[in-house]
Each structure stands twice: as structure tokens, then as C-alpha cells.
Amino acid sequence: MGVEGCTKCIKYLLFVFNFVFWLAGGVILGVALWLRHDPQTTNLLYLELGDKPAPNTFYVGIYILIAVGAVMMFVGFLGCYGAIQESQCLLGTFFTCLVILFACEVAAGIWGFVNKDQIAKDVKQFYDQALQQAVVDDDANNAKAVVKTFHETLDCCGSSTLTALTTSVLKNNLCPSGSNIISNLFKEDCHQKIDDLFSGKLYLIGIAAIVVAVIMIFEMILSMVLCCGIRNSSVY
């Protein structure tokens, strides 16, 4: 006999929640695998005119994305299938996975906070490499896309450490539309914006992490309540 009433509501809530989670994981995994195997991105990851690699952080970053996507799909599947099948075993596994993920998130948050200066340095280095690739190699479309994404996200243009290149980037339509005059240029230094993000705007990253943590706790509670509901309904 299946669960009834409020528990049934929780069952479908958990199903929908985890189906969305599973889909998001699929998208992340798909994008990460595409980034890993797309020749242009591989060039960007190794960023080579010669054979000098990009910062290890970003090479590893692709594999972290693949792992995150795979884990999200796996956990999403456990939650989805466990809820719809009303399986205590799957829901128990789902709960355990969430506890582990929660612990990982807390650990990653602490590590990120402790190493924020190094991460900011790596992000700046990656940005500089993409910026150079975008100017030096006319066919580096992925590098151009990376540069454009940085510029639009941070509302900046170029780097004061690469002044000559920045003037070229400016005219290649890779900067926000307001900054098309060279004399305005270095008011919008991306290095400064990256530093600001990792110091002044660190609270935004913190809020995002807290939101994810709250969702995880919420899912843990829902899975436990559903598990108890299933156990109780099987008694009668």
C-alpha cells in the first residue's frame, strides 16, 4: 500500500525536486564532456602557441565539473527513483549521499575561503591567457567566448598588465559596449574586478553556498520524513 496525504505530497515534491537536480547534473556533465573533448577548448585548456599549459586549477576544473555533473545525476536519480518507488533502501542511500555532499560543500567552502587569494590569482592568470589567445590566434573562438563572458559578467574590459593587447580586444567587440574608447579603458580593469569579487563580493558566493546547503538540508528532511512515512504505511 502506498503513502497517503501529506507524505504523498512530500513524495512528489521530492520527485520533482530531484528530477530537476538530475537534469541539471546532465547539463553540467554534458557541457563538461563537450569542453573536455572539443578541439578548440582543448587548445584553450592547454593554451598553446607553443606547449605551455594553463594553470592546473582549470585543467582540473573540467574534471571537477565532470565529477559534479555525474554525482548530481546519480544523487538526483536516487532521490527521483527512491521517491517514486517508495524505496527505503534508495532513500536511505540518497540521504547518506546528501550528508556526504553537505560535508564536501562545507569542506570546499572552508578550503575556498582559506585559499581565496590563490584562486583569484589563478582566475586572473586564466583570464590573461584567454585574453592573449583571443588576440594572437584569430581562430581561437573559445578563448574569445571566455574573454567575452568575463567582460560581460564582471562588467570590465581587459587588463592593465596587458595594455597593448587590451586595446586590440576592445576593437574586436569583446568588451561591454560602453568601453569602446581607449581613453576610458583602464577604469574597467578585469584584474581589479576579479580581486573585488574575491574580497568585497565574497558574501555573494557565501550566500549561494548557504542557499545550496539549505536546499540539501531541506532534501535530507524530506527524504527522512518520506522514509518514515513509507515504513509506517508498510506496518498497516
Epitope: 602557441l49 605551455k52 590573461d128 589567445q133 594572437v136 590566434d137 596587458l162 597593448a164 586595446t167 576593437k171
Partner: antibody, heavy 120, light 111 residues
């Protein structure tokens, strides 16, 4: 193929001004950077500055600010360099040189040079 | 401004031998992935011609006997084997920052 055709030799008096032209063909003039380089007789090369032909935005070597003015005319695909308050120190061959299409900071194609003699 | 000093000022090399020209910058012209140092060849009465870009990459159409190396502040242009038509003045140039500057030049003579 890319060609840069510069104006002919000039003989001018000290204190006067001169405008050297560089007509481009074989590529999209309006989305490229044009550089100007000075070479005095028997001497090395000096970078004067570069101009983006699309909007006339120019960057100068501090040494030539006030001396050289770079302009570009998209309709005729021609870049110009005006030199003012001429002295004997300005007697030189002046080259225009085009960068690659991304503005790759490489002087890939050069004009044949325009000789300027400043003498009274 | 970055000052580029070339050595030697002039060089005489026998046909088929190796010619080596050095260029030293007053500060680094390299980043983690590129060196913004380029080499040009100029023959009398002609404009300069790009030979080597980003320290070690041959410009298309340039013979493979030309090669470049170096990073940071020290760069080298090698020509091997030297041919008659290589008699010219060679300039290094950086585009790391404004203003771009050229080296003092090295005149190569073929014996």
C-alpha cells in the same frame, strides 16, 4: 593580396607641416590597426603610434605626441600621418605597417616608405 | 620604455655557416604563455619584413633556416645555413606594452 601604397617623397621647409598618406588594399581596412614607423638615414626604427581605422582611435609613442597626428579615412581606405613644426630631426623615411586582423601587435605588411626631407 | 639592445652591431658569416644575433630587453617582454618579441629583416631601400613572431614562431613564407628562441629578457635569432640573400640588417621588436620599441639593429654580411 595586401598592399600599402604610400605617398611620394617630400621636401619641406623647417616649421612647416606635411601629411603622408598610406592607401590600403586587399583586406578589410575598417577593422584593422595601422602603425607608423620612422627611420632616420642610416639609423634604426622608431615606432610612432597606431590607429584603429574603424573609428580613428589612436595610440601614440609619448615621444611623438604633439608632433604626429594619425587619422584614417574609411571611404578611401587611406591612413594619414600629419607631422607638424618640422625640423631637420624629422628628416627620415616613414613607413605605414598593418597589423593582423585581430590586432595581433605584429607589423605584418609594410608600405614602401615615404621619404621626408626638411631643409631650408 | 623598454630598451632593446642587439649584439653584435655587425656580423660577417661565411656562406652555409650559422649566424647568431642576440637581443636583450631592459625588462621582461614575456608572459606565462607568450613572448612578445619579433624579428624583422630589412634590405637596403626596402621596408622591414617580419620573419619570426612571438620569439620562436616562423611567419608564413619565411624559409625554415630562420629560427628564434628565448624568453623573458634574452632572445636569439639563428640563421643556418646562411645564404647570399640573407645579407641585410636584422631588428628585434617588442609589443609587450606601449610604446613598441625596436632593437639597435645587426648588419649581416656574407663572406
Amino acid at each position: 593580396q595586401v598592399q600599402l601604397q604610400q605617398s611620394g617623397p617630400e621636401l619641406v621647409k623647417p616649421g612647416a607641416s606635411v601629411k603622408i598618406s598610406c592607401k590600403a588594399s586587399g583586406y578589410t581596412f575598417s577593422s584593422s590597426w595601422m602603425n607608423w614607423v620612422k627611420q632616420r638615414p642610416g639609423k634604426g626604427l622608431e615606432w610612432i603610434g597606431r590607429i584603429y581605422s574603424g573609428d580613428g582611435d589612436a595610440i601614440y609613442n609619448g615621444k611623438f605626441k604633439g608632433k604626429a597626428t594619425l587619422t584614417a579615412d574609411k571611404s578611401s581606405s587611406t591612413a594619414y600621418m600629419q607631422l607638424s613644426s618640422l625640423t631637420s630631426e624629422d628628416s627620415a623615411v616613414y613607413f605605414c605597417a598593418r597589423e593582423g586582423k585581430t590586432g595581433d601587435l605584429l607589423l605584418r605588411s609594410w608600405g614602401q616608405g615615404s621619404a621626408l626631407t626638411v631643409s631650408s | 620604455d623598454i630598451v632593446l639592445t642587439q649584439s653584435p652591431a655587425s656580423l660577417s658569416v661565411s656562406l652555409g655557416q650559422r649566424a647568431t644575433i642576440s637581443c636583450r630587453a631592459s625588462k621582461s617582454v614575456s608572459t606565462s604563455i607568450y613572448s612578445y618579441m619579433h624579428w624583422y629583416q630589412q634590405k637596403p631601400g626596402q621596408p622591414p619584413k617580419l620573419l619570426i613572431k612571438y620569439a620562436s614562431y616562423l611567419e608564413s613564407g619565411v624559409p625554415a633556416r630562420f629560427s628564434g628562441s628565448g624568453s623573458g629578457t634574452d632572445f636569439t635569432l639563428n640563421i643556418h645555413p646562411v645564404e647570399e640573400e640573407d645579407a641585410a640588417t636584422y631588428y628585434c621588436e617588442h609589443s609587450r606594452e606601449f610604446p613598441f620599441t625596436f632593437g639597435t639593429g645587426t648588419k649581416l654580411e656574407i663572406k
